[in-house]
Interface confidence: low
């Protein structure tokens, strides 16, 4: 646990008056319908709110939308619908907000059936002004910004054309027809799949993967027999149909598709799927679905090339393609991930890894909680976290787990304490050390959010009744104050705070309902006067992440290094501030076997750090496919975990020899790949 403080709850002085002076109500002159909210830029305070209302008439549906803008974090809104000529905006495309602080916004309008193309409204000044542009096509997808240049946009049309704009949507050019899926890569590269015969669906497994690095002037076919493709970190993945049957395999490239290697992962059949759960520049978590309608599969973790994989977790819950998985990256502490497994008795249990998938364990039981009815032994049980799967099953879980990179160590989640996830009403639990230890934070389900980099946690009870009370904590959830933000309760629909958890403003969204009408309303509360002063050096304390044995000089070593953080003391009521930067000090560790994954053909028996040869591969040459050549692997069973920075200590040897034989990969080999220019 992070450094503890006095257990007694010190109340924040005069908070009611301070918050009352900083609570701003805005009633929207709208019938209820739906509302969507987007933040434009970082630390700009600009929010766009789009309300839409459908009036079903006898023959058709008449739609009306309104656009509102705030530039003070939601305290005040101005109706700017006239800037978009009172046009009805298509909510399924959302508001396409440009990357970083570009200030760019694209809204896609609804147009009448007979029009030649769609219509967009573009802003490049944080929605102060909009330009109407008629499109030469009907968009099928939201406009996608190039991550490198926000002037470059791509979109697919309803007729499967790939359209590109180089001047932020002013002028559009169709660069390819018969396109199924398109994605921006790095350096303004576009990857896309094309069909040759009938349609995307009909050609699934016979698609071609193309690349253009010059926005459509020239193209290169980088793969054939493609089922689908994906990008993760520096890896490009494609699932490719096998020659002889209906199975498919994952191929991976780290050079934008110039060369490919077959990933050492099981092939999958027609009803199965692969899913990239998480990826960074070092490695990938890949889920491989089990045959049959099991609802689970296996998580594998890759090496640094994305080629050799280690089994990380069995029976990983993942319902169907595009279905539900609870896999969660805990962004507040390096190396930590949480997910669910489906046990033999079909109960669902939560597992956590602190070392990027090397080992998974159950979550420690919170000290202030009892084991529930699911526990066979009332003294021994674990915390189980509700995430996407529970939400999809309509359990009383309003929110997925929450963590923020700049609120170091903090994880908030709904959960139950027992042998498995319970269908009973969950409580809210908090960890202040990245998931090692947990405490019950709030009784019953709540919405929650983190403000001021962890300096404040805000929560609202999840209730079917109207609400008018918000709870807040200045000590990482140990003690809570309640504040009545309005006399007249509202039907609550959501909490909104600026992404990144640096803000001190929270917006409570809901609607009021009277006999005649219902209206959208928002209350924005600024907590700046609760945290009266800026935090000083004395308000922070040193905390060693991943510490489990303070006695050990190697304590806290994860992936070959440890990190000491400056953490805000729980007892300090002060502002981290918008410019707060996490202060951390890394130090390198000696290598141990824990810093190595088991190599291809090896596995780790449970509770053992040594890698042993897989019985079925004993005595066989280990051969695998690399860049279209067969390789011979001489190994003593270990390979360094991607991203591991350890030095010295144990050093298992690994050697790869080129067998100079071709692999039977279904990809075009690099020398046969064709290029063409427009």
């Amino acid at each position: 646990s992070a450094p503890g403080e006095d257990e007694e709850c010190g109340r924040v002085r005069d908070f009611v008056a301070k918050l009352a002076n900083n609570t701003h109500q805005h009633v929207f002159d709208d019938l209820r319908g739906s509302v969507s909210l987007s933040w434009v830029g970082d630390s700009t305070g600009v929010i766009l709110v789009l309300t839409t209302f459908h009036v079903p008439l006898v023959i058709m549906t008449f739609g009306q939308s309104k656009l509102y803008r705030s530039e003070d974090y939601g305290k005040n809104f101005k109706d700017i619908t006239d800037l978009i000529n009172n046009t009805f905006i298509r909510t399924e495309f959302g508001m396409a907000i440009g990357p970083e602080n570009s200030g760019k916004v694209v809204l896609t309008a609804e147009v009448s059936g007979g029009s030649r193309g769609g219509r967009i409204f573009r802003s490049s000044d944080f929605a102060k002004n909009f330009v109407q542009t008629d499109l030469p096509f009907h968009p099928l997808t939201q406009m996608m910004y190039s991550p490198q240049n926000s002037d470059y946009l791509l979109a697919l049309s309803t007729e499967n054309g790939l359209w590109v704009s180089k001047n932020f949507g002013g002028k559009w050019e169709e660069i390819h027809k018969a396109v199924c899926l398109a994605k921006w890569g790095s350096d303004n590269t576009i990857f896309f799949t094309t069909y040759a015969n009938g349609s995307c669906k009909a050609d699934l497994g016979a698609l071609e993967l193309w690349r253009t690095s010059d926005l459509g002037k020239s193209f290169k076919t980088i793969g054939v027999k493609i089922y689908s493709f994906g990008l993760g970190g520096r890896f490009l993945f494609a699932s490719v149909m096998a020659d002889k049957d209906t199975t498919r395999r994952i191929h991976v490239s780290t050079d934008q598709g110039d060369t490919w290697s077959m990933a050492q992962l099981p092939s999958v059949g027609q009803e199965q799927f692969y899913s990239i759960l998480a990826a960074n520049d070092d490695m990938v978590f890949m889920h491989v679905d089990e045959p049959g309608d099991t609802g689970f599969g296996t998580i594998f973790t890759s090496d640094d090339r994305g080629i050799v994989y280690s089994k990380s977790l069995d029976r990983h819950l993942y319902t169907t393609t595009g279905g539900e998985t609870d896999f969660t990256n805990v962004t507040s502490l390096r190396g930590v991930y949480i997910t669910s497994v489906l046990s033999e008795d079909n109960s669902i249990q939560t597992m956590i890894t602190f070392d990027q998938g090397g080992r998974w364990t159950h979550l420690r039981k919170p000290e202030n909680s009892e084991c529930d009815a699911t526990a066979k032994n009332k003294n021994e049980c674990s915390l189980h976290i509700h995430a996407s799967y529970s939400i999809s099953q309509k359990l009383n879980v309003p929110m997925a787990p929450l963590s923020e990179p700049n609120a170091v160590g903090i994880v908030i989640a709904h959960g139950s304490v027992g042998d498995a996830i319970s269908v009973m009403v969950p409580d809210v639990y908090i960890s202040d050390d990245g998931g090692y230890s947990w405490t019950k934070m709030l009784e019953g389900p709540h919405y929650y959010t983190i403000l001021d980099s962890g300096g404040i946690i805000v929560a609202i009870e999840h209730s079917s009744r109207p609400i008018n009370v918000i709870k807040f904590s200045t000590d990482e959830g140990q003690c809570w104050q309640t504040y009545t933000f309005t006399r007249d309760p509202i039907y609550f629909t959501g909490l909104a705070s600026e992404p990144g958890a640096r803000s001190m403003n929270i917006s409570i969204w809901g609607f009021t309902e009277s006999f005649l009408t219902s209206q959208w309303v928002s209350y924005t509360i600024d907590f700046k006067d609760i945290l009266e002063r800026n935090c000083e050096e004395k308000d922070y304390t040193i905390w060693l992440a991943h510490s489990t044995d303070p006695e050990d000089y190697e304590d806290g070593c994860i992936l070959g290094y440890k990190e000491q953080f400056l953490r805000l003391r729980k007892s300090s009521v002060c502002q981290n501030g918008r410019d707060y930067v996490v202060t951390k000090q890394p130090s390198i560790c000696l290598c141990s076997l824990e810093d190595f994954l088991c190599d291809f053909g090896y596995y780790r028996p449970e509770n053992d750090s040594k890698c042993v040869e897989q019985p079925e591969l004993k005595g066989h040459d280990l051969e695998f496919c690399l860049y279209g050549r067969e390789e011979h692997l001489t190994t003593n069973g270990y390979r360094k975990i991607p991203g591991d920075k350890c030095q010295g200590g144990v050093n298992p040897v690994r050697e790869v020899k080129d067998l100079k034989k071709k692999c039977t990969s279904n990809f075009l080999s690099p020398e046969k790949q064709n290029s063409k220019s427009n």
Partner: antibody, heavy 117, light 108 residues
Framework: EVQLVESGGGLVQPGGSLRLSCAAS????????MSWVRQAPGKGLEWVAT????????YYPDILKGRFTISRDNAKNSLYLQMNSGRAEDTAVYYC??????????WGQGTLVTVSS | DIQMTQSPSSLSASVGDRVTITCRVS??????LAWYQQKPGKSPKLLVY???NIADGVPSRFSGSGSGTDYTLTISSLQPEDFATYYC??????????FGQGTKLEIK
């Protein structure tokens, strides 16, 4: 007030052994790592050994491994350095230092070890 | 092992002068560096830890700066009691935690 007092220094024959002690007071001894550092006459500081707070983990530079042994007795608030197979180049003032991790924040006054025939 | 290069090895200065001592390290040590002062016949005294943090009881004229591989100890206005030898030491990762060879600061 934090105090570290070394003792046990003196003259030792080449090949001989010596055991240095360091008595700690004024702080909670059993939660701190401790180190020995030496300084040959007219030379700079050289790190000799470190031991973790409970005595489980010990660290030495490669050139001293096998000849020097650091240990501690938390019940007695004491730190020790066992020197074996003494060599002329081991002649130095030996300091014990409290070592919380990122620095050696308190040092003893030192004890002189002379290896000579 | 990490190599520490301290410079200059000796330096003459007068009371009131601003003095800078540098420590260059063979690889990035991420600010895991301490500075010590040692007077003749005395034990070393910690001045700065974690590259920039002044230890308790150390006068404010001492300051530490730097990151990566280059670190500096600065004395803003030299006092008579500051004439001594100064050492840097890294604490990057696991041992050996090497010291710099020292800088002897003498009266001009």
């Amino acid at each position: 007030e934090v105090q570290l007092v070394e003792s046990g220094g003196g003259l030792v024959q080449p090949g001989g052994s010596l055991r240095l002690s360091c008595a700690a007071s004024g702080f909670t001894f059993n939660i701190y790592g401790m180190s020995w550092v030496r300084q040959a006459p007219g030379k700079g500081l050289e790190w000799v050994a470190t031991i973790s707070s409970g005595g489980i983990y010990t660290y030495y530079p490669d050139i001293l491994k096998g000849r020097f042994t650091i240990s501690r007795d938390n019940a007695k608030n004491s730190l020790y350095l066992q020197m074996n197979s003494g060599r002329a180049e081991d002649t130095a003032v030996y300091y014990c230092a409290r070592h919380p991790g990122g620095a050696m924040d308190y040092w003893g006054q030192g004890t002189l070890v002379t290896v000579s025939s | 092992d990490i190599q520490m290069t301290q410079s200059p090895s000796s330096l003459s200065a007068s009371v009131g002068d601003r003095v800078t001592i540098t420590c260059r390290v063979s690889e990035n040590i991420y600010s895991n560096l301490a500075w010590y002062q040692q007077k003749p016949g005395k034990s070393p005294k910690l001045l700065v830890y974690a590259a920039t943090n002044i230890a308790d009881g150390v006068p404010s004229r001492f300051s530490g700066s730097g990151s990566g591989t280059d670190y500096t100890l600065t004395i803003s206005s030299l006092q008579p009691e500051d004439f001594a030898t100064y050492y840097c030491q890294h604490f990057w990762g696991t041992p050996p935690w090497t010291f710099g060879q020292g800088t002897k600061l003498e009266i001009k």
